[in-house]
């Protein structure tokens, strides 16, 4: 039960954490206007990783985008990379999860499939929410840099070249839900890893064996906990018999670590 | 179409406050801005505030301590209500519809106010 | 506060006339988001409130004829009228709308000869 209860809710923290991360990635606002100097603007500038947008007090908007590529910075190029391997992972991670979860049956897939499924998912759900972390870290770096430069040979405008006094940017709303959304993708990872090695097989190489004892019918499988009174307790995943006795099919099986009888 | 009128009292006391109500139509003041300029007898266009559509207010920075502008949405009406009025307050007071590039694109035909005891 | 300084103060011309009027700014209307400079023009008659012509400085407004030209940037702005005509007669005014208050120049009058 808690192995699923963990996949179950790393899955939906991943979901919202990946979900947070295309929302940032598209959001306008990477870098705002930093109205410190000039609180009385009349016009309020942002940018996001696509398009740079002015706010009049009006209430018009206007949103260009930059429709250039080698005359963007190439620091702006790695984080809209970075935001995009972060989504593209946390998308592939989510469907493999989707199929790992122990609370839907598909055919007749093992748990050991499952586990590695989940344990797949969960290293993507990390790398993704890591690209989405860093990525907004960078950018956010380079802001704090540009903010401290000199306002000459600047860009104007993440796409523009003309040199004129550059407008101070601080950090926008979408470097935040980044940054938010990446530590649940994180989180959301890590709990699938640890919902993995739940589902893990034990390392074991019988199955259940039963036998008969002074007329009590008693049945125990490696790992459980004691099916009947007068054995002391065995949750210590201890062999509780070594002999030979095989099921009649003779074939390996790992049972589950919560399949109690 | 877009109009915009003003209604004033005409003639005020010094000392006492002046209220102005702007009535709008062709538009909505939830979007679009509302300002007001004033012009004194033979003299030059002077900015006084400005209603946006999200309710913020800007005043000019010489009147911020006795200006106030309000809006009633429902009513389509705008209010300008200027306090401790000088004789230098004599003007005719325009409200102006704020449009691209924060340009004045409609104006009310004004009203005159005179300050006199 | 900006502080416009329009230049002449009256102009006296005759119809048909390429006239041209000047407008500095105190500090640069220029917004380097949009690369648009934050100036406006206007034209009032006498008895009549001001009338729009031109905004960022040099996008006419429609209806406005387009013998009425604004140019410039940064700090420095000029209104042209290519050929004056007799309704042209009226004092035009340069507003700051870059920052608050959005102050106005103290206007251009133009007479006829």
């Known amino acids: 039960m808690a192995v699923t209860a963990c996949q179950g809710l790393g899955f939906v923290v991943s979901l919202i954490g990946i979900a947070g991360i295309i929302a940032a990635t598209c959001m306008d606002q990477w870098s705002t206007q930093d109205l410190y100097n000039n609180p009385v603007t009349a016009v309020f500038n942002y940018q996001g990783l696509w398009r740079s947008c002015v706010r009049e007090s009006s209430g018009f908007t206007e949103c260009r985008g930059y429709f250039t590529l080698l005359g963007l910075p190439a620091m702006l190029q790695a984080v809209r990379a970075l935001m995009i391997v972060g989504i593209v992972l946390g998308a592939i991670g989510l469907l493999v999860s989707i199929f790992a979860l122990k609370c839907i049956r598909i055919g007749s897939m093992e748990d050991s499939a499952k586990a590695n499924m989940t344990l797949t998912s969960g290293i993507m759900f990390i790398v993704s929410g890591l690209c989405a972390i860093a990525g907004v870290s960078v950018f956010a770096n380079m802001l704090v840099t540009n903010f401290w430069m000199s306002t000459a040979n600047m860009y104007t405008g993440m796409g523009g070249m003309v040199q004129t006094v550059q407008t101070r940017y601080t950090f926008g709303a979408a470097l935040f839900v980044g940054w938010v959304a990446g530590g649940l993708t994180l989180i959301g990872g890590v709990m699938m890893c640890i919902a993995c090695r739940g589902l893990a097989p034990e390392e074991t190489n019988y199955k259940a064996v039963s036998y008969h004892a002074s007329g009590h019918s008693v049945a125990y499988k490696p790992g459980g906990f004691k099916a009947s009174t007068g054995f002391g307790s065995n949750t210590k995943n201890k062999k509780i018999y070594d002999g030979g006795a095989r099921t009649e099919d003779e074939v390996q099986s790992y049972p589950s670590k919560h399949d109690y009888v | 179409q877009v109009q915009l009128k003003e209604s004033g009292p005409g003639l005020v006391a010094p000392s006492q406050s002046l209220s102005i109500t702007c009535t709008v139509s062709?538009?909505?003041?939830?979007?679009?801005?509302v300002s007001w300029v004033r012009q004194p007898p033979g003299k030059g266009l002077e900015w006084l505030g400005v209603?946006?559509?999200?309710?913020?207010?800007n005043y000019h920075s010489t009147l911020i301590s006795r200006l106030r502008i309000s809006k009633d949405k429902s009513k389509s009406q705008v209010f300008l209500k200027l306090n401790s009025l000088q004789t230098d307050d004599t003007a005719t007071y325009y409200c102006?519809?704020?449009?691209?590039?924060?340009?004045?694109?409609?104006w009310g035909q004004g009203t005159s106010v005179t300050v006199s005891s | 506060d900006i502080v416009l300084t329009q230049s002449p103060s009256s102009l006296t011309v005759t119809a048909g006339e390429k006239v041209t009027m000047s407008c500095k700014s105190s500090?640069?209307?220029?917004?380097?988001?949009?690369?648009?400079?934050?100036l406006t023009w206007y034209q009032q008659k006498p008895g009549q409130p001001p009338k729009l012509l031109i905004y960022?400085?040099?996008t006419r407004e429609s209806g406005v004829p387009d013998r009425f030209t604004g140019s410039g940037s940064g700090t420095d702005f000029t209104l042209t009228i290519s050929s004056v005509q007799a309704e042209d007669l009226a004092v035009y005014y340069c507003?700051?709308?870059?920052?608050?208050?959005?102050?106005f120049g103290a206007g251009t009058k133009l007479e006829l000869k």
């Open positions: 102006a519809k704020a449009g691209r590039g924060n340009a004045l694109d409609y």
């Open positions: 062709g538009f909505s003041l939830t979007t679009y801005g």
């Open positions: 209603i946006w559509g999200d309710g913020s207010t």
């Open positions: 500090q640069s209307l220029l917004n380097s988001g949009n690369q648009k400079n934050y």
């Open positions: 960022w400085a040099s």
């Open positions: 507003q700051n709308d870059y920052s608050f208050p959005l102050t």
